[in-house]
């Protein structure tokens, strides 16, 4: 039975040219996290594997940085980065948990950054 829940940063906005941290946190389960995938719509951005560490997809290497923790930092944002992002936690024995974040990249300087949190 899957008892865990994923907390995310929810809906967030950021300024064009800036950077943003996408953060998810899996709680209420003792399942072992074997891998976390970060995806944008159908594109794989990055993987953090428990044994192999981080792997950034080649097409995003210049604009994506690993961390903090199991989160992902997006840099040099463009309006095309607006959209849904998913953190997919592969766990044993529970299975897969998915969290959703919606990012809006704004042209103006009045972008309000959503609440962020760090994984302890």
């Amino acid at each position: 039975m899957m008892t865990g829940t994923i907390e995310t940063t929810g809906n967030i906005s950021a300024e064009k040219g800036g950077s943003i941290i996408l953060q998810c946190h899996l709680s209420s389960t003792t399942a072992q996290v074997t891998q976390v995938n970060w995806e944008q719509q159908d594109q794989l951005l990055a993987i953090c594997n428990a044994d192999l560490g981080w792997h950034i997809s080649p097409s995003f290497k210049d604009r994506v940085a690993p961390g903090p923790g199991l989160g992902l930092t997006l840099q040099s944002l463009t309006v095309n980065d607006t959209g849904e992002y998913f953190c997919i936690y592969h766990t044993y024995p529970d299975g897969t948990y998915t969290g959703r974040i919606f990012l809006e990249v704004l042209e103006s300087s009045v972008a309000e950054h959503g609440a962020r949190f760090q994984i302890p």
């Epitope: 891998q35 594997n49 044994d51 192999l52 560490g53 981080w54 792997h55 950034i56 690993p66």
Partner: antibody
């Protein structure tokens, strides 16, 4: 006792192919990620490739991407490295190693691959 | 890719000496830093993982420290069997990369 035994090395001409094997024993092979590391004569260590425990994820150094393929057969406790379009700069001792929590914890004795005409 | 720079590339020391080898990463790698020992004609052997954890069976005279970009391997009292080449390796992000090695020779 953990044992990793590489085989399949040898002399091959530039442009040729080789398949290296690594037979594992003494540990739960199917639960471990595995990798290949090479060492050119008189040089340092270079990571070549890695594969997740299930075989579903494979990763390569840029220097071998598109030419080398890592795979595994968990039913045979064996890791493979298919090497195509070999170049002189691929000449090295190739080590297979088990990977646990981001470290190479056990290594084979290595097999020498020589690419020369 | 993350570049790993080891220093010195070689050193001469005597039995009983305290030896320090440093490794610098071109970007922060948290504590995902491993150290290996290699003797001529042999496979590398894991000494230290995660910056400071001693691999099972490795003598306690070996220790590791550091975080971020700067790391150190220390041999508190060099023994005859410690003359070898030592490599650092980052495992924060693929591709995993090694330092160029430090050869510890007998003075």
């Amino acid at each position: 006792e953990v044992q990793l035994l590489e085989s399949g090395g040898g002399l091959v001409q530039p442009g040729g192919s080789l398949r290296l094997s690594c037979a594992a024993s003494g540990f739960a092979f199917s639960s471990y990620a595995m990798g290949w590391v090479r060492q050119a004569p008189g040089k340092g260590l270079e990571w070549v490739s890695a594969i997740t425990s299930s075989g579903g994820g494979t990763y390569y150094a840029d220097s071998v991407k598109g030419r080398f393929t890592i795979s595994r057969d968990n039913s045979k406790n064996t890791l493979y490295l298919q090497m195509n379009s070999l170049r002189a700069e691929d000449t090295a001792v190739y080590y297979c190693a088990s990977i646990r929590e981001r470290r190479f914890d056990f290594w084979g004795q290595g097999t020498l691959v020589t690419v020369s005409s | 890719d993350i570049q790993m720079t080891q220093s010195p590339s070689s050193l001469s020391a005597s039995v009983g000496d305290r030896v320090t080898i440093t490794c610098r990463a071109s970007q922060r790698i948290s504590t995902y830093l491993n150290w290996y020992q290699q003797k001529p004609g042999k496979a590398p052997k894991l000494l230290i993982y995660g910056t400071s954890s001693l691999q099972s069976g490795v003598p306690s005279r070996f220790s590791g420290s550091g975080s971020g970009t700067d790391f150190t391997l220390t041999i508190s009292s060099l023994q005859p069997e410690d003359f070898a080449t030592y490599y650092c390796q980052q495992s924060y992000i693929i591709p995993w990369t090694f330092g160029g090695g430090t050869k510890v020779e007998i003075k």
